[in-house]
C-alpha cells in the first residue's frame, strides 16, 4: 500500500461569543485538512479527532464519524468544527479578548488531530500538531494557511 | 515598566498651533489604540479621540474635528495631539491614555500619561 | 454621540456612609460583540484619572472590594458601601461601546 497524506492546512474560520457574568470565551474554529489518497483503490476516511490546547490545557475536543471515502489517486478537502472554551482558571483571557483598545486580540493555539483511515479491514492513524494563531475578539474568517503568519502581540515579561 | 510620558507645559497665544506628544515605554504603541482626553479647569473630561498608530487611522469626537489632529510615530514610539486656531476655550489638561497587556497572564492595565497643562493667554 | 447623563453633580457624604452614583446613557451601549463597556474612573486634583470599574461590574486590579458597579441597558450604578477620604474626587462614568466614546459630566464626592 502507498501513503495516505494528511496535511493540516489551518484555520479556516473562528466565530467567538461571550459570557459577561461567567467571564468565559465560546470559540467555535473550524478548519482544514487535505487529505490524499496515493492507492490504487479507495479509502474511507472513518473518524478525525481534533483537540485544541491553550496554555497546555485543553480547551475543546471534536470527534467527526463516518466522514467520507476518497478514491483512488484522489484528494479531498475536508472542514472541522472543534467547539473551545476558555474559562474558569483562564478567565483572565476575558479581559484581552474583550479590551477594546487592541485591534487583533491574536491567542496562540495548539491544534492537534488524527485521522483514522481503512482500506480493506486494514485500518491506519495519521497525526498532526501545528501552533495556530486565533483572534479571541471577533469573528474571523481567513485565508487558508493566513493564520500560520498572523502577529500575535507579545506581552512584556 | 509600562507608562506614558508627556511633553510639558505650554503657554500658548491665541490662533497659534501646539503640538503635544505623549511617549511610550514597556510596551509598543503600534499593538494599541491610543486615546486623548481634555479636562478644562473646574470641568469635566472630554474624549477627543482615538488613534491607531500602525496605520495613523484617527477617529475624532465631532466637537474637536478641525481643531485636533492626533498622529503617531511608532519608530520612537509616541503618539502626538496637535491643536490649531488655539483660543482660551482649548485652555486645558490633556491626557493620553490606553490600556496595555502587560504581562504573560495577559493582564491589563489602564494606562495614563500624567498629563500635558496648555494655557492659551494673549 | 451617545450621551452620558450623571446624577449627582455632588455628593456629600459622611465618611464610613454608604454613597452612591447614579449614570444614564441615551441609547443601549451594547457593544457588537455583546458586552457593555460601561467604565467609572475616579479624578483627583493634580492626578490623572484612575480606573475603578469596567464593563459594568467588573472591578479593576487593585480596587477595593467597597466599589461595586451594577446596571444594564441605558441605567448604571456605582456604590462605595463604606466611604474613605481617599476616594473623596469626582467620579466618571464612560461608555467605551460607540465611537465617538464619552464621558459623564462628573459627580464630586465631598465631605459633608
Known amino acids: 500500500p502507498r501513503s495516505i497524506d494528511v496535511k493540516y492546512i489551518g484555520v479556516k474560520s473562528a466565530y467567538v461569543s461571550y459570557d459577561v457574568q461567567k467571564r468565559t470565551i465560546y470559540l467555535n474554529i473550524t478548519n482544514t485538512l487535505n487529505i490524499t489518497n496515493n492507492n490504487y483503490y479507495s479509502v474511507e476516511v472513518e473518524n478525525i479527532t481534533a483537540q485544541v490546547q491553550f496554555a497546555k490545557t485543553v480547551i475543546g475536543k471534536a470527534r467527526l464519524n463516518n466522514i467520507t471515502h476518497i478514491g483512488p489517486l484522489d484528494m479531498k478537502q475536508i472542514d472541522y468544527t472543534v467547539p473551545t472554551v476558555i474559562a474558569e482558571e483562564m478567565s483572565y483571557m476575558y479581559d484581552f479578548c474583550t479590551l477594546i483598545s487592541i485591534k487583533v486580540h491574536n491567542i496562540v493555539l495548539m491544534m492537534q488531530v488524527t485521522v483514522t483511515t481503512t482500506y480493506f479491514g486494514h485500518s491506519e492513524q495519521i497525526s498532526q500538531e501545528r501552533y495556530q494563531y486565533v483572534d479571541c475578539g471577533r469573528n474571523t474568517t481567513y485565508q487558508l494557511g493566513q493564520s500560520e503568519y498572523l502577529n500575535v502581540l507579545q506581552p512584556q515579561q | 515598566e509600562v507608562q506614558l510620558q508627556q511633553s510639558g507645559a505650554e503657554l500658548m497665544r491665541p490662533g497659534a498651533s501646539v503640538k503635544l506628544s505623549c511617549t511610550a515605554s514597556g510596551f509598543n504603541i503600534q499593538d494599541y489604540y491610543m486615546y486623548w482626553v481634555k479636562q478644562r479647569p473646574e470641568q469635566g473630561l472630554e474624549w477627543i479621540g482615538r488613534i491607531d498608530p500602525e496605520d495613523g487611522d484617527a477617529e475624532y469626537a465631532p466637537k474637536f474635528q478641525g481643531k485636533a489632529t492626533m498622529t503617531a510615530d511608532t519608530s520612537s514610539n509616541t503618539a502626538y495631539l496637535q491643536l490649531s486656531s488655539l483660543t482660551s476655550e482649548d485652555t486645558a489638561v490633556y491626557y493620553c491614555?490606553?490600556?496595555?497587556?502587560?504581562?504573560?497572564?495577559?493582564?491589563?492595565?489602564?494606562?495614563w500619561g500624567q498629563g500635558t497643562s496648555v494655557t492659551v493667554s494673549s | 454621540d451617545v450621551l452620558m447623563t450623571q446624577i449627582p453633580l455632588s455628593l456629600p457624604v459622611s465618611l464610613g456612609d454608604q454613597a452612591s452614583i447614579s449614570c444614564r446613557s441615551s441609547?443601549?451601549?451594547?457593544?457588537?460583540?455583546?458586552?457593555?463597556?460601561l467604565e467609572w474612573y475616579l479624578k483627583k486634583p493634580g492626578q490623572s484619572p484612575k480606573l475603578l470599574i469596567d464593563?459594568?461590574?467588573n472591578r479593576f486590579s487593585g480596587v477595593p472590594d467597597r466599589f461595586s458597579g451594577s446596571g444594564s441597558g441605558t441605567d448604571f450604578t456605582l456604590k462605595i458601601s463604606r466611604v474613605e477620604a481617599e476616594d473623596l474626587g469626582v467620579y466618571y462614568c464612560f461608555q467605551g461601546s460607540h465611537v465617538p466614546y464619552t464621558f459623564g459630566g462628573g459627580t464630586k464626592l465631598e465631605i459633608k
Open positions: 464593563k459594568i461590574s
Open positions: 441609547q443601549t451601549i451594547v457593544h457588537s460583540n455583546g458586552n457593555t463597556y
Open positions: 491614555s490606553t490600556r496595555v497587556i502587560y504581562d504573560g497572564y495577559y493582564r491589563t492595565m489602564d494606562c
